[in-house]
Amino acid sequence: QPPPPPPDATCHQVRSFFQRLQPGLKWVPETPVPGSDLQVCLPKGPTCCSRKMEEKYQLTARLNMEQLLQSASMELKFLIIQNAAVFQEAFEIVVRHAKNYTNAMFKNNYPSLTPQAFEFVGEFFTDVSLYILGSDINVDDMVNELFDSLFPVIYTQLMNPGLPDSALDINECLRGARRDLKVFGNFPKLIMTQVSKSLQVTRIFLQALNLGIEVINTTDHLKFSKDCGRMLTRMWYCSYCQGLMMVKPCGGYCNVVMQGCMAGVVEIDKYWREYILSLEELVNGMYRIYDMENVLLGLFSTIHDSIQYVQKNAGKLTTTIGKLCAHSQQRQYRSAYYPEDLFIDKKVLKVAHVEHEETLSSRRRELIQKLKSFISFYSALPGYICSHSPVAENDTLCWNGQELVERYSQKAARNGMKNQFNLHELKMKGPEPVVSQIIDKLKHINQLLRTMSMPKGRVLDKNLDEEGFESGDCGDDEDECIGGSGDGMIKVKNQLRFLAELAYDLDVDDAPGNSQQATPKDNEISTFHNLGNVHSPLK
């Protein structure tokens, strides 16, 4: 093993380097000193470092680490932010279209109901939107309220159109009769099932994406411990104290330090993998009754069928209601003629079918595919950070935290650090409280996602979940279907080009909380760049 070169007799190189890091030279010794007060860069002989310099190195090392972590997660973070925004907007558009379709159905088939029907339909779809965004509303109550509100209008406008104003106080009675007599048959129940299942899945999908953002934000803004700061300082900066300005850390040493510093973060890996796979399961199951696009856009048809059902049973119902709500009834039921086949104006509801056009379903699949690119993200972070900070290739003449060596030996390094900070201790400390919290949230959402995926009869790919990771993994840079009469009713295909309506591409500036995320400018984004090229080992 070659002896370390003698330290710079005047500390001149160290001074000029440190000045770029911290203007002013008051902390830098002019000539090598014993360095008995040093706590991190423990000297084997005279040193060009002081305690204050050590502190500055530690701060810089931690900032560099944070910056590297942020640059690593930039693409993944924007992917989720962008998609959460796109899907939220897309779901709003679906709700808006569904409301318009339902209103069009009333306008074209039951014009006498329109003023009130529009109001009730509007309230229903407002509740749908609020539910998707996480509001504490019961879907069954929403559907019940829609039909409770509609029936008195249907009764007074369609079934009994000549009722005098004095008879209109029967509304409460009619609302009650609606449920007791099951005047809409099983349609309200059918709608409850479809709407609640599809909205539940939609809501949890959005929740999962928002949690994804939270996970990245949490790890993105981790403050590394002082212990980690000491290890990073020893690896990146202590060589400077001996005047070894050009030497690089040993690759193996860097990996050990990063595994130690990021032990808590890497613990997220298992739950992150499960998160992506569970989200994929959910997305695979988002069709038919579990696809809000499909359900909500077909709702007008089911509501139309339910009104036809009432009309078919009008005679029977009127007699029964006449008895139930007798005190308010002023006249006998006078049946009006309604044609059997009530078609929706195809011009109003026609949805163009375009070959290969993009649907929410294809966009979801695309998101999952892209997310799967990042399934090993957390296990790869230590390797990414080592590969983005200078390390000696093949460990030839490299820095092991204490001295210049021909190759890194973990055992020797551990022995040499007996009196210093122990790498093993750092690993054993467990994750930071914020990391533990985010792991708990991931466990919770994974549980929810799995629960939601169960009815589809799919099982997570055990193979993928249980696969061991090779060391190289870190090394790079890196049921029911929708009911409906079908009698000539047009089916609204799941082919709306919503994504053409919304900003599919969401420019970087439009992404929430992402103003500078995608294109860091060398001179503005962080310490890592601000520190300049000379002193930073991370160039």
Partner: antibody, heavy 119, light 107 residues
Framework: QVQLVQSGAEVKKPGASVKVSCKAS????????MNWVRQAPGQGLEWIGW????????NYAQKFQGRATLTADKSISTAYMELSRLRSDDTAVYFC????????????WGQGTLVTVSS | EIVMTQSPATLSLSPGERATLSCRAS??????LSWYQQKPGQAVRLLIY???NRATGIPARFSGSESGTDYTLTISSLEPEDFAVYYC?????????FGQGTKLEIK
């Protein structure tokens, strides 16, 4: 060290099929996408599609849909690209390239396999 | 599909000079852009991903930036080994697409 080693050059007749292999090492094969890209003589690069070896999920460029088939054998960490109904304009160097885990960009590439289609 | 247009097709410069390679996307790609280097007989190499992030082992003289749908690869001071063909690639929307390439040659 991540390595992608591809099978050797092939000469095929029009209408035939070719199957190119790509053996991966140095990383967890199942957990990254494997892309296939081709380059006709003197031309630029063209993406064929990708496969996720963990579950066999695939995505193809429309142009190659129905003619290219991407498969993977996890047990030997090898990805395959089969192209059927070969035409003379399929003569190209075919590359495999890995995506992930920090970017969807293609972080590592194979050395390429020349496929010549000639009668 | 998204069309990526690179310019110039050929760039003739001397070592030590600054090289600026351009790539324009036919529609927004939200910074999902990579740059690759290809030399004869060698594997293609990822230089920059997500517009501005240097890949493993890529020297600091390589940098990437964007302005709207225009993306730029800059090599601050050319080294002899930098003379090669450079491709940009978008991975915002399927199918992933490449530019036609810019050949950087010694003047």
């Amino acid at each position: 060290q991540v390595q992608l080693v591809q099978s050797g050059a092939e000469v095929k007749k029009p209408g035939a099929s070719v199957k190119v292999s790509c053996k991966a090492s140095g990383y967890a094969f199942s957990n990254s996408w494997m892309n296939w890209v081709r380059q006709a003589p003197g031309q630029g690069l063209e993406w064929i599609g990708w496969i996720y070896p963990g579950d066999g999920d695939t995505n193809y460029a429309q142009k190659f849909q129905g003619r290219a088939t991407l498969t993977a054998d996890k047990s030997i960490s090898t990805a395959y690209m089969e192209l059927s109904r070969l035409r003379s304009d399929d003569t190209a160097v075919y590359f495999c390239a890995r995506s992930g885990p920090i970017t969807m960009g293609f972080t590592y590439w194979g050395q390429g396999t020349l496929v010549t289609v000639s009668s | 599909e998204i069309v990526m247009t690179q310019s110039p097709a050929t760039l003739s410069l001397s070592p030590g000079e600054r090289a600026t390679l351009s790539c324009r996307a036919s529609q927004g790609i939200s910074n999902y852009l990579s740059w690759y280097q290809q030399k004869p007989g060698q594997a293609v190499r990822l230089l920059i991903y997500y517009t501005s992030n240097r890949a493993t082992g890529i020297p600091a003289r390589f940098s990437g930036s964007e302005s709207g749908t225009d993306y730029t690869l800059t090599i601050s001071s050319l080294e002899p080994e930098d003379f090669a063909v450079y491709y940009c690639q978008q991975y915002s929307k399927f199918p992933w697409t490449f530019g036609q390439g810019t050949k950087l040659e010694i003047k």
